[in-house]
C-alpha cells in the first residue's frame, strides 16, 4: 500500500505554497479527472523571456519512508498552439527537493542551508506535443519519480518554471509499505518497502492472541519493494483450548476441547465427559466415570466394571484343590482392559461371615492372584475342615486401588470338610524321649460343635530316609498321641489325618509332614511347650 505524505487533491482549502516571484505560479480552483473540485497551480508566462518562477510546497515529513515517490499530474500547453510565443515558450519544467529537519517556512527555496537537489526535468508525454487539435489539452500527464534514500526528518518539493504554460493539477508524495497484516496467525507490522533495487526486508511476526510459534523460530515474512509481502516462513498455531478462525484463534466452545497446539480444530468431548467452560484443554469425566492415567484426553471416560457373572467352583479333596471359573462382567465399563483379582478369606466354620481373615501366604493361586486376564483360577494348599470365602473382583484401568475390596466382585463360600486341618506349625511336640514322642494339635472342629466328639485321628510315622511304604500307624480319638517303641537318636517323619463319621479315611489327606528326632540314651526327657 501507499502511505500518503502529501496529496494536493485532498485539500479544498488553499494550499498556500510559496510562489516566488509573485507574478509566477498562481493558485486557482479547478477540477480533477473525476470532475471533483481541487486546488491547482498554474503558470503561463510564455511571452516573456528569462522566466525563473519557483513554487515550494510546505514541509513534508517523510515518516518511516526512505525511498519516496513523487507523482505529478499536469497539463503542458503545446507552444505551437500559442501565437507569438515561439521564441520564449518552453515545454518543460524542473522538480527539486530539499531535505531539512524542520519546516523552512516561506523563504526562497534556495535558502535554508543546503541547495535543492534536482529530481528531473519534466516534459509532456510525446503525444501531447504533436497534437495540433487541442485534444492534448485535457489529457493529464502523469509522471512518477523516486527520490532518496532520505536521511533527514522531512523535505520540501520545489517546481521551477522556465517559461512553460503548465497547470500542476496534482502533487502526490508517498512511500510504499507492506501493510500490517495477519498471515499464518502471525501479525506483521506495517513495514516501509526499500527501493526496487534493494533486498527484501525480513520482518518477524508476532503470534496472534492465544497462539504460539515454534520455540525460537518466530514466523517471518519479507516486504518487497512494491509493497507486497512475499516468502512467508513458518506460522503460528492456536494454543490448547483455541482453534483457528480466519486470522485469529477462538476459544473452543463448551462441549469442545483442544489438547495441543498441534491439533488444528477443537474436538467434541469424548463420550461421558463434558467441558462446561470456553477454551477447555480437556473434558472432565461425568460423575462415576473416569480416565486412567494412561488414557489420552481423547479417550472416552469409562467406569469400573460390574462384578464377574456366574462364578462356579469345583472342589477336589485329594489333593485339596479349589477350581474357580466365571464369565465376564455384564458391564465392562466401556473398557477392554478388564482383569480379575482374587481375595481368599478363611472363616470360622459357623457364625457370621465377618469372622474371616485373609488366608495367608500359604494358599497358592494359579496362574496368579491378581491381574488375571483368564477367567479361571485354582487355589492350592487349602486346609481341610475349613470354610473359605473367595471373592473374584473385575477391575479395569479406572478401578481405584481399593476396588478389589469394593462391591464389584462375585464370591463363593466353600467348606473343605474334615481332614488334616493343620498347618505344620500347629502340631506341638509336647515331649521327646529316647524311645517315645508325644504330639498334640488343635481339634479341626471346635469342641461342642456337632461332630466334634466323633472325630478320629490317624498318625502315620516312619524313619526318615526309609521308604514311605514301611510306615507304622496308630489311631486316637483325642487330639493328642504318644508314640512308643522308637529308636533313640533317630529322626522320624510324622503325618496326621482326621476323619469324622461321614467320609472314609481314603477321602482325606495327611497333613504336611513334621520331623522329630528322638533323644539319645544318655539324654534326659524334655517337655517342649512351643510348637515345632
Amino acid at each position: 500500500e501507499e502511505v500518503i505524505l502529501l496529496d494536493s487533491k485532498a485539500s479544498q482549502a488553499e494550499l498556500g505554497w510559496t510562489a516566488l516571484p509573485s507574478n509566477g505560479w498562481e493558485e486557482i480552483s479547478g477540477v480533477d479527472e473525476h470532475d471533483r473540485p481541487i486546488r491547482t497551480y498554474q503558470v503561463c508566462n510564455v511571452l516573456e523571456p528569462n522566466q525563473d518562477n519557483w513554487l515550494q510546497t510546505g514541509w513534508i515529513s517523510r515518516g518511516r519512508g526512505q525511498r519516496i515517490f513523487v507523482e505529478l499530474q499536469f497539463t503542458l500547453r503545446d507552444c505551437s498552439s500559442i501565437p507569438g510565443a515561439a521564441g520564449t515558450c518552453k515545454e518543460t519544467f524542473n522538480v527539486y527537493y530539499l531535505e531539512t529537519e524542520a519546516d523552512l517556512g516561506r523563504g526562497r527555496p534556495r535558502l535554508g542551508g543546503s541547495r535543492p537537489r534536482k529530481i528531473d526535468t519534466i516534459a509532456a508525454d510525446e503525444s501531447f506535443t504533436q497534437g495540433d487539435l487541442g485534444e492534448r489539452k485535457m489529457k493529464l500527464n502523469t509522471e512518477v519519480r523516486e527520490i532518496g534514500p532520505l536521511s533527514r526528518r522531512g523535505f520540501h518539493l520545489a517546481f521551477q518554471d522556465v517559461g512553460a504554460c503548465v497547470a500542476l493539477v496534482s502533487v502526490r508524495v508517498y512511500y510504499k509499505q507492506c501493510r500490517a497484516t495477519v498471515r499464518g496467525l502471525a501479525t506483521f507490522p506495517a513495514t516501509a518497502a526499500e527501493s526496487a533495487f534493494s533486498t527484501l526486508v525480513e520482518v518477524a511476526g508476532t503470534c496472534v492472541a492465544h497462539s504460539e510459534g515454534e520455540p525460537g523460530s518466530p514466523p517471518r515474512m519479507h516486504c518487497g519493494a512494491d509493497g507486497e509481502w512475499l516468502v512467508p516462513v513458518g506460522r503460528c498455531s492456536c494454543s490448547a483450548g483455541f482453534q483457528e478462525r480466519g486470522d485469529f484463534c477462538e476459544a473452543c466452545p463448551p462441549g469442545f476441547y483442544k489438547v495441543s497446539p498441534r491439533r488444528p480444530l477443537c474436538s467434541p468431548c469424548p463420550e461421558h465427559s463434558r467441558a462446561l467452560e470456553n477454551a477447555s484443554t480437556f473434558c472432565v469425566c461425568q460423575d462415576s466415570y473416569a480416565r486412567s492415567p494412561t488414557d489420552p484426553p481423547s479417550a472416552s471416560c469409562t467406569r469400573p466394571p460390574s462384578a464377574p457373572r456366574d462364578l462356579q467352583y469345583s472342589l477336589s479333596r485329594s489333593p485339596l484343590v479349589l477350581r474357580l471359573r466365571w464369565l465376564p462382567p455384564a458391564d465392562s465399563g466401556g473398557r477392554s482392559d478388564v482383569t480379575y483379582s482374587l481375595l481368599c478369606l478363611r472363616c470360622g466354620r459357623e457364625g457370621p461371615a465377618g469372622a474371616c481373615e485373609p488366608c495367608g501366604p500359604r494358599v497358592a493361586f494359579l496362574p496368579r492372584q491378581a491381574g488375571l486376564r483368564e477367567r479361571a483360577a485354582t487355589l492350592l494348599h487349602l486346609r481341610p475342615g475349613a470354610r473359605y470365602t473367595v471373592r473374584v473382583a473385575a477391575l479395569n484401568g479406572v478401578s481405584g486401588p481399593a476396588a478389589a475390596a469394593g462391591t464389584t466382585y462375585a464370591q463363593v463360600t466353600v467348606s473343605t470338610g474334615p481332614g488334616a486341618p493343620w498347618e505344620e506349625d500347629e502340631i506341638r511336640r509336647d515331649r521327646v524321649e529316647p524311645q517315645s514322642v508325644s504330639l498334640s494339635w488343635r481339634e479341626p472342629i471346635p469342641a461342642g460343635a456337632p461332630g466334634a466328639n466323633d472325630t478320629e485321628y490317624e498318625i502315620r510315622y516312619y524313619e526318615k530316609g526309609q521308604s514311605e511304604q514301611t510306615y507304622s500307624m496308630v489311631k486316637t480319638g483325642a487330639p493328642t498321641v504318644t508314640v512308643t517303641n522308637l529308636k533313640p537318636a533317630t529322626r522320624y517323619v510324622f503325618q496326621i489325618r482326621a476323619a469324622s463319621p461321614g467320609p472314609s479315611w481314603e477321602a482325606q489327606s495327611f497333613n504336611p509332614s513334621i520331623e522329630v528326632q528322638t533323644l539319645g540314651e544318655a539324654a534326659s526327657g524334655s517337655r517342649d511347650q512351643s510348637p515345632a
Epitope: I28, G30, G131, K139, C165
Partner: antibody, heavy 120, light 112 residues
C-alpha cells in the same frame, strides 16, 4: 448546481452564419481544468461533437468542420459562443452546450438544447 | 475518424430484467497516457442526454449502481442489472481518446 442554457436564432437561411450563446452557472471557466463545448443532434439521429474551449483559452475543433467554426468565451459574463459560417440545411439540428468533465473530455453536464433550422 | 458501433439498435426488455449494450470502436481507445476515454450517455425522450459512465467504468455522481460499464481496447459493454421504467430511452457510447470525439448510433431500450 451546474446549469447551462443555449440560445440561438431558431431559423436562418443557407449561407448565413449561425451564432449560438451558452450561458452557464455553477462553475467558473477560469478554474483550472474547466472546459465548455458544443454538440449537435439532427432530429432522430446521433450526436456530433463540434468544438471545446478551455479555461486557458485553448480550443479544439472537429476537423471536418474546423474551417467553419469559431468558439470563444467571456469569463466575466459566464458565456461561451459558437459561430458556424456558411450554414446549409445539413446544419439543421438541436445544438447542446456542454460542460466538459475534468481532464477526460466527457460531457458531464448538458443544456436543454436549442433547435436551429436552416431553411430556404 | 474513429467509428463507434453500437449493438443492438433496439433492445426490448421487461422491467426487472438485466440489459446489456455493446459498443465497439474501429481502433483502440487506450490513450498514450494509459487511460481509456469511453463514456456512456442516456437520452430520455424529449430530454437532453445525461452522462452515466465515464472512462469505461466510473459512474458519474447520482447515477444508480445498477448501471455498470466494462471493457477494454475496442470492446465495451454497458449493463443495467435490473431495468426500471426510468431507464428507458436511447443509450449512446462516445469516445474522446481521439479527435474528433465521436458517438455511437444509439441503442433504444424499450419495454417488450
Amino acid at each position: 448546481q451546474v446549469t447551462l442554457k443555449e440560445s440561438g436564432p431558431g431559423i436562418l437561411q443557407p449561407s448565413q452564419t449561425l451564432s449560438l450563446t451558452c450561458s452557464f452557472s455553477g462553475f467558473s471557466l477560469s478554474s483550472s481544468g474547466m472546459g465548455v463545448g458544443w454538440i449537435r443532434q439532427p432530429s432522430g439521429k446521433s450526436l456530433e461533437w463540434l468544438a471545446n474551449i478551455w479555461w486557458d483559452d485553448d480550443k479544439s475543433y472537429n476537423p471536418a468542420l474546423k474551417s467553419r467554426l469559431t468558439i470563444s468565451k467571456d469569463n466575466s459574463r459566464n458565456q461561451v459562443f459558437l459561430k458556424i459560417a456558411n450554414v446549409d440545411t445539413a446544419d439543421t439540428a438541436t445544438y447542446y452546450c456542454v460542460r466538459v468533465g475534468g481532464y477526460g473530455d466527457y460531457f458531464a453536464y448538458w443544456g436543454q438544447g436549442t433547435l436551429v433550422t436552416v431553411s430556404t | 475518424d474513429v467509428v463507434v458501433t453500437q449493438t443492438p439498435l433496439s433492445l426490448p426488455v421487461s422491467l426487472g430484467d438485466q440489459a446489456s449494450i455493446s459498443c465497439r470502436s474501429s481502433q483502440s481507445l487506450v490513450h498514450s497516457n494509459g487511460n481509456t476515454y469511453l463514456h456512456w450517455y442516456l437520452q430520455k425522450p424529449g430530454q437532453s442526454p445525461k452522462l452515466l459512465i465515464y472512462k469505461v467504468s466510473n459512474r458519474f455522481s447520482g447515477v444508480p449502481d445498477r448501471f455498470s460499464g466494462s471493457g477494454s481496447g475496442t470492446d465495451f459493454t454497458l449493463k443495467i442489472s435490473r431495468v426500471e421504467a426510468e431507464d428507458l430511452g436511447v443509450y449512446f457510447c462516445s469516445q474522446s481518446t481521439h479527435v474528433p470525439y465521436t458517438f455511437g448510433g444509439g441503442t433504444k431500450l424499450e419495454i417488450k
